[in-house]
Interface confidence: medium
Amino acid sequence: SERCDDWGLDTMRQIQVFEDEPARIKCPLFEHFLKFNYSTAHSAGLTLIWYWTRQDRDLEEPINFRLPENRISKEKDVLWFRPTLLNDTGNYTCMLRNTTYCSKVAFPLEVVQKDSCFNSPMKLPVHKLYIEYGIQRITCPNVDGYFPSSVKPTITWYMGCYKIQNFNNVIPEGMNLSFLIALISNNGNYTCVVTYPENGRTFHLTRTLTVKVVGSPKNAVPPVIHSPNDHVVYEKEPGEELLIPCTVYFSFLMDSRNEVWWTIDGKKPDDITIDVTINESISHSRTEDETRTQILSIKKVTSEDLKRSYVCHARSAKGEVAKAAKVKQKVPAPRYTVELACGFGAT
């Protein structure tokens, strides 16, 4: 058949939906691959065709739009399931074509099961709340377009397995859940169950997200260098190994890039001829403050190396800091017998 621009399997858009719930899936062509929208395509005489490949099969087959109660239907650029079944899992393809043009993309759809406490293999979005920051809200995600604005759904919120009612600092307000003052104890999975009627049937939408309480911008400080510091002197003899850790604390800052680097005599270690290695490790606190450690290592230090300046630098959105390590050569202990002998004129 004629050539078709095939965008392949778009694994970036791994779509997961719950079993026995409505799902509306937009054709990704118009969102991510083409420069025009569905309306433009439709008015230009292009047709959108859907087909699928079942899980563990190679055969592409058309989607059956003649199921009882219109269980699967298409509306403009949206594929509807009312509701999904477990065996709807597979790779779905939407193809836009006319006699002279063709473009298609496939994407994986996984129908997942949940238990009575909403546990499932679903990848959960993470919503970050600032600790002790005043009122903050989360909104029940991905429910737009399922019912018209004239329909008033009922929304029930859960934390883990428990319905949220009479909680100290968490208040359900329809599609929103308000945290009066977020604390570490508010970390967890929150689920909204949206129930709405349609054509004499009742449908449920379940949406779970993870709330992570993080450091507040009110408490954020520029990077703090714990080591090197004024309390520690790196006193070495030539031939010994020199190990200097640079340990830096970074306050949590949304979308901030935290950087730590060493300079030796004002240059990056890569730009000098010393045989130096640097190993980095990163750890996080409960509020996602970060501690980065970079260990500078010179296996066999020379007396020249011990005269150099070793400076640890750190940078975040809050500022840049630097601290020099105190490095010096060990003074050998005097050899008293020889010196005393010389003093007495011995030869």
């Epitope: 703090v224 080591s227 309390h231 520690v232 790196y234 190990l243 200097i244 850790p245 604390y249 260990i295």
Partner: antibody
Framework: QVQLVQSGAEVKKPGASVKLSCKAS????????MNWVRQAPGQGLEWVGQ????????YYAQKFQGRATLTVDTSTSTAYMELSSLRSEDTAVYYC????????????????WGQGTLLTVSS | DIQLTQSPSSLSASVGDRATITCRAS??????????MHWYQQKPGKAPKLLIK???DLESGVPSRFSGSGSGTDFTLTISSVQPEDFATYYC??????????FGQGTKLEIK
């Protein structure tokens, strides 16, 4: 996970010396101060001193200056405390304890402890 | 050197009671934003265990019935509802400045 495993009980005579060990695992040994704390039978906790393994920098409580020596072997992630000129009042359980890191320079808490080594000094 | 004085030296409580231990430093162990005061629990024959660091920061894994407060020279450890496993000795500890750390003399929490 972080673990500090200390050497076994010791019995020494007055005037002798003893060297206790503390093997660390589960974290980057050289980047945390290691402290030694002792506890005489039925008494409270008493800080002996601390060492920064990366550099060998040490600090001692005045009482132990000159009598306690803290060292480390970074290749085996082991800290040592040697106590010389032992006397009967040195009979105690000796703990090694790691300091945590905090956002501010200055005081650190002792977040992980070894199981303790009982030193008995008796003639 | 900074001295720490804990009170009371022993405390009797029943399961479910609220227990409060105080620790007074001979000079301030606080600066803007934090205090170098920590609390430990020790059971007979065991190593101390960190409960609260920097006056009020609950150590990971420690039950939320433990809380700490205070700044400057006066600090408090509170157990909101004493449980059977809480009967132990509690120590305050300051780490203000290098190189001297000191501990309070301890408070023994006993069953009433």
């Amino acid at each position: 996970q972080v673990q500090l495993v200390q050497s076994g009980a010791e019995v020494k005579k007055p005037g002798a010396s003893v060297k206790l060990s503390c093997k660390a695992s589960g974290y980057i040994f050289i980047t945390y101060w290691m402290n030694w704390v002792r506890q005489a039978p039925g008494q409270g906790l008493e800080w002996v001193g601390q060492i920064f393994p990366a550099s060998g920098t040490t600090y001692y409580a005045q009482k132990f200056q000159g009598r306690a020596t803290l060292t480390v072997d970074t290749s085996t992630s082991t800290a040592y405390m040697e106590l010389s000129s032992l006397r009967s009042e040195d009979t105690a359980v000796y703990y090694c304890a790691r300091t945590d890191f905090y956002r501010y320079d200055g005081g650190y808490a002792l977040d992980y402890w070894g199981q303790g080594t009982l030193l008995t000094v008796s003639s | 050197d900074i001295q720490l004085t804990q009170s009371p030296s022993s405390l009797s409580a029943s399961v479910g009671d609220r227990a409060t231990i105080t620790c007074r430093a001979s000079q301030s162990v606080s600066t803007s934003g934090y205090s170098s005061m920590h609390w430990y629990q020790q059971k007979p024959g065991k190593a101390p265990k960190l409960l609260i660091k920097y006056a009020s920061d609950l150590e990971s894994g420690v039950p939320s019935r433990f809380s700490g407060s205070g700044s400057g020279t006066d600090f408090t450890l509170t157990i909101s509802s004493v449980q059977p496993e809480d009967f132990a000795t509690y120590y305050c500890h300051h780490s203000w400045g290098i190189p001297m750390y000191t501990f309070g003399q301890g408070t023994k929490l006993e069953i009433k």
